[in-house]
């Protein structure tokens, strides 16, 4: 094998999904022609054929159709291989075998890599933390390759090595998801950083969490509200649920209850010193006085308006206190769409018509969909506008421009995304010529 074949000594590093060039070259003698060349790329470990060139012709890829030579450069001795859309499974050694009169070969290593995502940090428990509590901090980073190195440190940069458990799991593509768990006893406050290092790319992804244990005053009364937003129809009454656990011997004289808007602290309703102080919110709120002593601090909001939408804080103070916020999501159903046609008479196949679908007084903003008689979505040439009235309710007008066939049905669907309510209208245009609406 007197032919000298040259490849890079260092591995070729390629990111997953990108293209990689495995360089290979030889020195052609004077008078060399491609008809003399036999070039074979194969996997070193298994001799599986990857790509070949013989008898003056590129024999093509034998490797998932993801390889290519550089045909214009072969005559100059460039036998490099292009590997497209690199996968983790491609990692390994590739042998470049060149035969002219004599022959030679050399192997080049492909090192595959994928950067790790910025770690996400979670805390358990994640509220009412006090100095001395033990917390579990989880650091998760995704879709990297090869396996990561994980380091933890405190706010001063001091490494934290005790009580760390790290697991790495490969997905179907061979990419790793890393989960590292640190158990730590809280001090007065502290910052905990997690660094996920890709050893091939020398890429560091890091995140940190600063834990400030609760201060005095502590707010030890547990106030419970629904996690999900309360959905209320415009004009109806809504109950914003809020409850606390009264201690034995509790009397309403001890209770301070304040409902306020979370974002502005505007007072909504209050109960102090055993007395309902009434509504401070357009006289549309009420408590449930008979239920207060059992810990039911819920608020009734009457004749809901769009402007009521938002977050309400329920603040309860007895000996100690606590608060929680509940979200009100306002909704109004859309009317059945009315359909109009322009022009609306003497229509013939090939005419362009404008179909307008109008639906009124809904909230929040609607999603509008058009489709033909076969249920095929119509997305081109659609213009939708939504305008809020004084009450904040939306009127929707959606315009479809369409070229008429021999006949056809056009449907418009107006969806309220909160109520998951669909209002639809359709128009069928048949025959020729015709008038719309059809004459009686």
């Amino acid at each position: 094998g007197a032919l000298e074949v040259q490849v890079p000594e260092d591995p070729v590093v390629a990111l997953v999904g990108t293209d990689a060039t495995l360089c290979c070259s030889f020195s052609p003698e004077p008078g060399f022609s491609l008809a003399q060349l036999n070039l074979i790329w194969q996997l070193t470990d298994t001799k599986q054929l990857v790509h070949s060139f013989a008898e003056g012709q590129d024999q093509g890829s034998a490797y998932a159709n993801r390889t290519a030579l550089f045909p214009d450069l072969l005559a100059q001795g460039n036998a490099s291989l292009r590997l497209q859309r690199v996968r983790v499974a491609d990692e390994g050694s590739f042998t470049c075998f060149v035969s002219i009169r004599d022959f030679g070969s050399a192997a080049v290593s492909l090192q595959v890599a994928a950067p790790y995502s910025k770690p996400s940090m979670t805390l358990e428990p994640n509220k009412d933390l006090r100095p001395g509590d033990t917390v579990t901090i989880t650091c998760s980073s995704y879709q990297g390759y090869p396996e990561a190195e994980v380091f933890w440190q405190d706010g001063q940069g001091v490494p934290l090595t005790g009580n760390v458990t790290t697991s790495q799991m490969a997905n179907e593509q061979g990419l790793f998801d890393v989960h590292s768990i640190l158990r730590v006893v809280l001090g007065a406050n502290g910052t905990y950083s997690c660094l996920v290092r890709n050893p091939v790319l020398q890429q560091d992804a890091h995140s940190s969490v600063t834990i400030t244990p609760q201060r005095s005053p502590t707010g030890a009364v547990e106030v419970q509200v629904p996690e999900d937003p309360v959905v209320a129809l415009v004009g109806t009454d809504a109950t914003l649920r809020c409850s606390f656990s009264p201690e034995p011997g509790f009397s309403l004289a001890q209770l301070n209850l304040i409902w306020q808007l979370t974002d502005t602290k505007q007072l909504v309703h209050s109960f102090t010193e055993g007395r309902d102080q009434g509504s401070a919110y357009a006289n549309r709120t009420a408590l449930f006085p008979d239920l207060l002593a059992q810990g039911n601090a819920s608020l009734r909001l009457q004749r809901v308006r769009v402007a009521d939408e938002g977050s309400f804080t329920c603040f309860v103070s007895i000996r100690d206190f606590g608060s929680a916020a509940v979200s009100l999501q306002v909704a109004a159903p859309y009317s059945k769409p009315s359909m109009t046609l322009e022009p609306n008479k003497d229509l013939r196949p090939g005419d362009t018509v404008t179909i307008t679908c109008s639906s009124y007084r809904g909230y929040p903003e609607a999603e509008v969909f058009w489709q033909d008689g076969q249920g095929v979505p119509l997305t081109g040439n659609v213009t939708t506008s939504q305008m809020a009235n004084e009450q904040g309710l939306f009127d929707v007008h959606s315009v479809l421009r369409v070229v008429l066939g021999a006949n056809g049905t056009y449907s418009c669907l107006v969806r309220n995304p909160v109520l998951q309510q669909d209002a639809h209208g359709s128009v069928t245009i048949t025959g020729q010529p015709m008038t719309f609406p059809p004459e009686a």
Epitope: A188, S216, P217, G219, N256, K265, Q277, T313, S317, S323
Partner: antibody, heavy 118, light 110 residues
Framework: EVQLLESGGDLVQPGGSLRLSCAAS????????MNWVRQAPGKGLEWVAG????????YYADSVKGRFTISRDNSKNTLYLQMNSLRAEDTAVYYC???????????WGQGTTVTVSS | QSVLTQPPSASGTPGQTITISCSGS????????VNWYQQLPGTAPKLLIY???QRPSGVPDRFSGSKSGTSASLAISGLQSEDEADYYC???????????FGGGTKLTVL
């Protein structure tokens, strides 16, 4: 340790401007409403302005409305008070204080002195 | 002129009990909780009582607060020389959309 540290106080002429800063540490600044409170020499405490946790809602005392602007940069854990058209009666020690969910100002800075004089 | 009314001064001898009043209206004390602050000479105010009657950790139980209607009061029992300070009541006013303070009460321990 929970801390608020004011800076930016100075001697300024009537009609002049000044910007005060308050650096917060030791607590989750971006979840707290914040306030500026002042105290004129030998006088009582007077609330100046308040701002919500995201910075979108602000309240002002009538005496400073239209002249002072409260703002915050949560990425820097810093509260600001931009003071324009300053008057002699604005001379005071200015404190920043938190404003927690329970309508309590439980942490105060040490204050920075603003003197308005020609 | 402060929105909340406090006596400008109060005094007592060591061991005595004194009470400082704070009078407001239905838009502040009447529907909101009251906080009390102590300001020692040359220092920043410090939270003394919150939500009408609660003491932060570190505040001696000699200090107590209460509220009735549109008035609140701060009681200090077993008066000590280190209690000599200015005392302020404060709450949120829903009509003004503003924090309101009392004018402050200067406590002298004789």
């Amino acid at each position: 340790e929970v801390q608020l540290l004011e800076s930016g106080g100075d001697l300024v002429q009537p009609g002049g401007s000044l910007r005060l800063s308050c650096a917060a540490s030791g607590f989750t600044f971006n979840t707290y409403w914040m306030n500026w409170v002042r105290q004129a020499p030998g006088k009582g405490l007077e609330w100046v302005a308040g701002i919500n946790s995201k910075g979108g809602v602000t309240y002002y005392a009538d005496s400073v409305k239209g002249r002072f602007t409260i703002s915050r940069d949560n990425s820097k854990n810093t509260l600001y008070l931009q003071m324009n058209s300053l008057r002699a009666e604005d001379t005071a020690v200015y404190y920043c204080a938190d404003w927690n969910d329970y309508d309590i100002m439980d942490v105060w800075g040490q204050g920075t002195t603003v003197t308005v004089s020609s | 002129q402060s929105v909340l009314t406090q006596p400008p001064s109060a005094s007592g001898t060591p061991g005595q009990t004194i009470t400082i009043s704070c009078s407001g209206s239905s838009s502040n004390v009447g529907r909101r909780t009251v906080n009390w602050y102590q300001q020692l000479p040359g220092t920043a105010p410090k939270l003394l009582i919150y939500t009408n009657a609660q003491r932060p950790s570190g505040v001696p139980d000699r200090f107590s607060g209460s509220k009735s209607g549109t008035s609140a009061s701060l009681a200090i029992s077993g008066l000590q020389s280190e209690d000599e300070a200015d005392y302020y009541c404060a709450t949120w006013d829903d009509s003004l959309n503003a924090w309101v303070f009392g004018g402050g009460t200067k406590l002298t321990v004789l």
